[in-house]
Interface confidence: low
């Protein structure tokens, strides 16, 4: 008789990302018997959860339910019913969380507990809900684009499967921005990591990998936005803040009480003689730029080299991939080309930062106006975080890619938290088998 | 260039009230907060308040907040400061002045107007 | 309402240095930008800025004006005196509203 192939044998696993301003539900699926072989774990979807972070709900945790649903129903149509039950579903809440955390345990835990009980009620393999740490964040971030890129397979490949890809097997660097937190992880070239919390060590498919992470808490886009408002304000000592981060003739009116909501501008809180004020922007990418270097202090490193406030960073070393926001935000910008250089990137910024308000609404009509309004300084903050914060220059900036997705599945930090708590990433090579991709009988 | 022209010279009799207006020629005083100082003579400088024209929200100083009413009227890019129950205190020279963020230097001053109260 | 201190009055010879203080009543710092401005007062002419945020000169205004200071004390020095220094100097802070200095008189001998 003739060989039929077997039915389709994959396995499915959810991860929730629970950023700082959205969350995100990602499905991943690979074949059962090639768990432990490098880049055959894929996306097959996403949902992005309508609404706010989840740290959002922390005085309306009764709602959490009705927010996940829509997501949670999509999973359930996606993944075959025969799979439910053992489809893992962890979620990960990340900056957003951990600064609710710095204000109050009692009500992360509180969020995070009725988490866990709307997602048990799913018929999937829920595994908890937890907070990682920014070291986990960038870590995960690191495994899962060089997974992606086929980094860790030690087959030399006569193809190449990713645009990014270049022949051999060293790693790519990760940036990832967020809303509340930016991580950096990246193998520095022989250099000792000279601060202990920075150095992680792996040991993957056989090769050991020292790598340097830092998490910077505050310095996601939204938060950074948050504290250079909290820093100018003070300046101002008015009700106006003329803000060369915004278009000319834009204007918005913020309360004091949302400004200093957030543990990011504690530092900067001062008694203002007013409950609101008015943002009026004046479109100067310069002037931006120099209000959002004063973010960083520079002026105190007690290592051999740091990045910012004090934090150890090793000499910038190889490709870089930049995704999540650094992706989505330069994606709109339309500066993700490899062509573009960071001179151009900066000369585009100037034009675009400069250009009427009324004329961006009218050319991007489609786009809500909250996220329109902050590309600008959202633009010139990753230029400035690139370039002053972690030391880019001109020239390394070609070592930069810009990354929404590598082969079909989002550069992130899910893929990778995933890989690690299903143990798909082995410590020591696999030993190769003679099995074609279809087992016949 | 940024001018400010004040009307000119009052006399009042206690209790009466005195109005006096700031006229913004070269920007908008919008752009600006509008503050008042009163100076009696041979006396120091004594802030009264300030308006943000844009959302006309005033500010006084405690010294002043029941008697004087500071509005703007942005048609004319004049800027207004009213100062009711006139006792012979109140005699002085009144100046408006401009702010903009502190740490951008654009300051300018009107030229003041004498304000006498005698019966 | 922030209370600024100033010395009352200074007789100076030309050029000598003169030196006038203002003490605030709370700090007009706030992370690194500090709310102190200087004026100069003609008679019969409204004030003129000298000095903002404590040490920036306006423009205009001669190098000889200069001044310092940071928290709760702060100094307008002016080196070398001239003749045409006499007038009042006002200290004044913006760092919650305004409010002025007594003043200082200054007299060139």
């Known amino acids: 008789t003739q060989n039929k192939a077997l039915p389709e044998n994959v396995k499915y696993g959810i991860v929730l990302d629970a950023g700082s301003s959205h969350t995100s539900l990602y499905i991943y699926k690979w074949p059962a018997e090639k768990e432990n072989d490098t880049g055959v774990v894929h996306q097959v979807e996403e949902c992005r959860v309508k609404g706010p972070g989840i740290s959002k709900f922390v005085q309306k945790v009764n709602e959490i339910g009705i927010y996940l649903t829509d997501c949670m129903e999509r999973a359930r149509e996606v993944i075959p019913r025969s799979q439910h039950q053992e489809t893992p579903v962890y979620l990960g809440a990340t900056a957003g969380m951990r600064l609710l955390r710095m204000e109050s345990e009692e009500l992360a835990d509180r969020v995070l507990d009725v988490v866990e009980r709307s997602l048990s009620n799913y018929p999937f393999d829920f595994q908890g809900a937890r907070i990682i740490t920014g070291q986990e964040e960038g870590a995960y971030g690191w495994i899962t684009i060089n997974y992606l890129l086929g980094k860790f397979s030690q087959k030399t490949r006569w193809f190449s499967i990713v645009p990014y890809e270049t022949n051999n097997q060293e790693t790519f660097g990760a940036l990832d921005l967020g809303g509340a937190s930016t991580q950096v992880t990246f193998v520095p070239q022989n250099q000792t990591i000279e601060s202990p919390d920075n150095a992680l060590q792996f040991r993957l498919y056989g090769k050991d990998y020292n790598v340097y992470t830092h998490s910077f808490l505050c310095y996601g886009k939204d938060q950074a936005l948050w504290q250079k408002l909290a820093k100018d304000i003070q300046v101002a000592s008015n009700e106006i803040l003329r803000d060369p981060c915004f278009h000319p003739g834009y204007k918005k009116v913020v309360n004091v009480s949302d400004l200093y909501k957030t543990p990011c501008t504690k530092r900067f809180e001062m008694t203002l003689p007013f409950q609101q004020f008015e943002i009026q922007g004046i479109g100067n990418y310069q002037q931006c730029h120099q209000s959002i270097l004063e973010l960083f202090n520079t002026s105190y490193c007690p290592y051999s080299q740091c990045a910012f406030n004090g934090i150890f960073l090793p000499p910038l070393q190889g490709d870089f991939g930049a995704f999540s926001a650094f992706y989505f935000v330069m994606k709109f910008l339309n500066l993700t080309s490899e062509k573009v250089s960071q001179e151009k990137v900066t000369e585009m910024m100037k034009k675009f930062c400069a250009q009427p308000w009324e004329e961006i609404k009218t050319s991007y009509a489609g786009v809500k106006e909250k996220y329109l309004s902050e590309y600008c300084f959202s633009g010139t903050y990753i230029l400035s975080l690139l370039l002053q914060g972690y030391h880019f220059t001109a020239d390394s900036w070609e070592h930069i890619h810009f990354i929404g997705k590598i082969q079909g599945s989002d550069a992130g930090w899910t893929l990778g938290y995933m890989l690690n708590l299903t143990n798909m990433i082995p410590a020591e090579q696999p030993l190769s088998t003679p099995l074609s991709h279809s087992t016949y009988v | 260039e940024v001018q400010l022209v004040q009307s000119g010279a009052e006399v009042k009799k206690p209790g009466a009230t005195v109005k006096i207006s700031c006229k913004v020629s070269?920007?908008?005083?919008?752009?600006?907060?509008m503050h008042w100082v009163q100076q009696a003579p041979g006396k120091g400088l004594e802030w009264m308040g300030r308006?943000?024209?844009?959302?006309?929200?005033?500010k006084y100083a405690e010294k002043f907040k029941n008697r004087v009413t500071i509005t703007a009227d942005t048609s004319t890019n004049t800027v207004y400061m009213e100062l009711s129950s006139l006792r012979s205190e109140d005699t002085a020279v009144y100046y408006c002045?401009?702010?903009?963020?502190?740490?951008?230097?654009?300051?300018?001053w009107g030229q003041g107007v004498m304000v006498t109260v005698s019966s | 309402d922030i209370v600024l201190t100033q010395s009352p009055a200074l007789a100076v010879s030309p050029g000598q240095r003169a030196t006038i203080t203002c003490r605030t009543q709370?700090?007009?710092?706030?992370?690194?930008?500090?709310?102190m401005n200087w004026y100069q007062q003609k008679p019969g002419q409204p004030p003129k800025l000298l000095i903002y945020l404590a040490s920036s000169l306006a423009s205009g205004v001669p190098a000889r004006f200069s001044g310092s200071g940071s928290g709760t004390d702060f100094t307008l020095t002016i080196n070398p005196v001239e003749a045409d220094d006499t007038a009042n100097y006002y200290c004044?802070?913006?760092?919650?509203?305004?409010?002025f200095g007594g003043g200082t008189k200054v007299e060139i001998k």
């Open positions: 709370q700090t007009v710092d706030h992370y690194g930008t500090t709310y």
């Open positions: 308006i943000d024209p844009d959302h006309e929200r005033t």
């Open positions: 070269g920007d908008s005083i919008t752009a600006y907060f």
């Open positions: 002045a401009t702010e903009r963020v502190p740490g951008f230097e654009t300051d300018y």
């Open positions: 004044q802070q913006s760092r919650n509203l305004w409010t």
